[in-house]
Amino acid sequence: RGVFRRDAHKSEVAHRFKDLGEENFKALVLIAFAQYLQQCPFEDHVKLVNEVTEFAKTCVADESAENCDKSLHTLFGDKLCTVATLRETYGEMADCCAKQEPERNECFLQHKDDNPNLPRLVRPEVDVMCTAFHDNEETFLKKYLYEIARRHPYFYAPELLFFAKRYKAAFTECCQAADKAACLLPKLDELRDEGKASSAKQRLKCASLQKFGERAFKAWAVARLSQRFPKAEFAEVSKLVTDLTKVHTECCHGDLLECADDRADLAKYICENQDSISSKLKECCEKPLLEKSHCIAEVENDEMPADLPSLAADFVESKDVCKNYAEAKDVFLGMFLYEYARRHPDYSVVLLLRLAKTYETTLEKCCAAADPHECYAKVFDEFKPLVEEPQNLIKQNCELFEQLGEYKFQNALLVRYTKKVPQVSTPTLVEVSRNLGKVGSKCCKHPEAKRMPCAEDYLSVVLNQLCVLHEKTPVSDRVTKCCTESLVNRRPCFSALEVDETYVPKEFNAETFTFHADICTLSEKERQIKKQTALVELVKHKPKATKEQLKAVMDDFAAFVEKCCKADDKETCFAEEGKKLVAASQAALGL
């Protein structure tokens, strides 16, 4: 029942061109190139894509033509290595071009930058955008793919095609509307927020595969798909997991044409076998390809089958527990994970994986003991504290969120995390803590049964952002330890960190706390970021400051900004009142 066609193809590039069609082929090659060479100008990428596309067409016409038998990595790598300014723009990445495949592609992958030095995307006026869209729709949409791909080098390529389709639809509709801005801006905001979330979720999948291996990803997939498709039998879930792992391995490895092709095949298979997978797929399967794949990926959990028997009989009481474990370790653990996950849509995937790890560790120890059954008889009792820990943490943090609201909840987390890992850069601490704080509005509104999967799995995605940003410039052994020891225990590891007593407070620098009139024209979000940046810097200067001290200083700061933004001579106000504020803050914090 293998989904993926593995017939021998004389020309891989011709095969993918025919499968995907010219439009998708060009879009995916552009994404691939922009994700590898993140600094190259748009026009250069378009030129390279056009050259590759013309070449692919010659191979479609005659698969035996010169170079048509080369692998996609060879073809694309050769093309990237023709870029004239490679050494000047990318430095040591140019050394990749001296390598042979597959080492060359691995080298390019290692140079992907999660935080490229690129200007923030500024949204032009609506009329300017609509004119550009009407003048050259194709270029406008390619520019969108290019700008997103170069800023998000691990963005899930077939999903980016779906975002581009929605982006196009928004402009097609809204540029004809009476009030273009009212129509377009909310749609663009939604696409931006969904896009950031999609990018972060995919980044975790790639980190899981690349840092912890295929087994870790497969375990995650077994748990998630078993929650989503609890009526599907284990053999079906295993098959889907194998295929999904292949799709994500390809995308994370830069094999975007294969990835998109295989994802389409997987969606087709799922829809052809809905009856044995899930009753929730009907609507998804009526949609066109890109919408269908997206819909399947987001589909709600099916209802659990009635009267599922106790797990203890097969996994604790059976005489064959150790035989099963010895004969087929990973399959047996996979069955355990499947059976546990399908019964617990109320648990986070990471919790389910912790339970499976505990079960595995217990069997590893007990199956070598004199009386294995006596040894593992109470294994399920070991699960209780593991389940209660995230439950209690979520309860406490949702109470705090409801009490404070999002902005102040973010501030509480900013203080908490700056004290844990003060060596981390201020922009990273602000970005990560703001995202951690969004868990409140995202998840605390849910009933108890949905809170944990929402919250803890979201936190895994956000903490992975911290891990990949920190990996680029490591500054904290504690971050490295939490990020690398165990994928599923990252969140508990960070939660358990106390104030870093070894940290030497940062020298006070008045410049850090000097503000200007430009703050008054910023959006509410940007103004919050400015204040939160100041808060992190305060904590770095005075890590032992109490909540009350920090609150007093922040309240004074908010009043100062409000006062000066209302003043006639704003700049003078910021200069004079700013000095007073810095002096008062130093006194309040004993700096």
């Epitope: 284990f234 064959d320 004969e327 399959v331 069955m335």
Partner: nanobody
């Protein structure tokens, strides 16, 4: 607890075909290994065929190419399609199940058994 009930046995001429069924109740057995054993009068019970969770089948040499084991997990049922039957296939056929990842071939490995169905091959 798993209960197993076989059906489909009977009298058939040499060269004929029969399809045995085994219905499981008590709990779903899609992840269980399931097997058919047989016992001819005055002989030991012997392994015929087994199938695992992945629907991978194994057969005794004496039935290879003639018998096909299958399962329908939606119906919680196991089947044995017997073609080209011979007089030496005459026996009581038993269905068995156990929660094992790798399907065993020894009767002592199986936890659950049906009461058996008689197959007689005679002209």
């Amino acid at each position: 607890e798993v209960q197993l009930v076989e059906s489909g046995g009977g009298l058939v001429k040499p060269g004929g075909s029969l399809r045995l069924s085994c219905a499981a109740s008590g709990r779903p057995v899609s992840n269980y290994a399931a097997a058919w054993f047989r016992q001819a009068p005055g002989k030991e019970r012997e392994f015929v065929s087994a199938i695992n969770w992945q629907k991978t089948a194994t057969y005794a040499d004496s039935v290879k190419g003639r018998f096909t084991i299958s399962r329908d997990n939606a119906k919680n049922s196991l089947y044995l399609q017997m073609n080209s039957l011979r007089a030496e296939d005459t026996a009581v056929y038993y269905c068995a199940a156990v929660f094992r990842v790798v399907a065993p071939k020894t009767q002592y490995d199986y936890d659950y058994w049906g009461q058996g169905t008689l197959v007689t091959v005679s002209s």
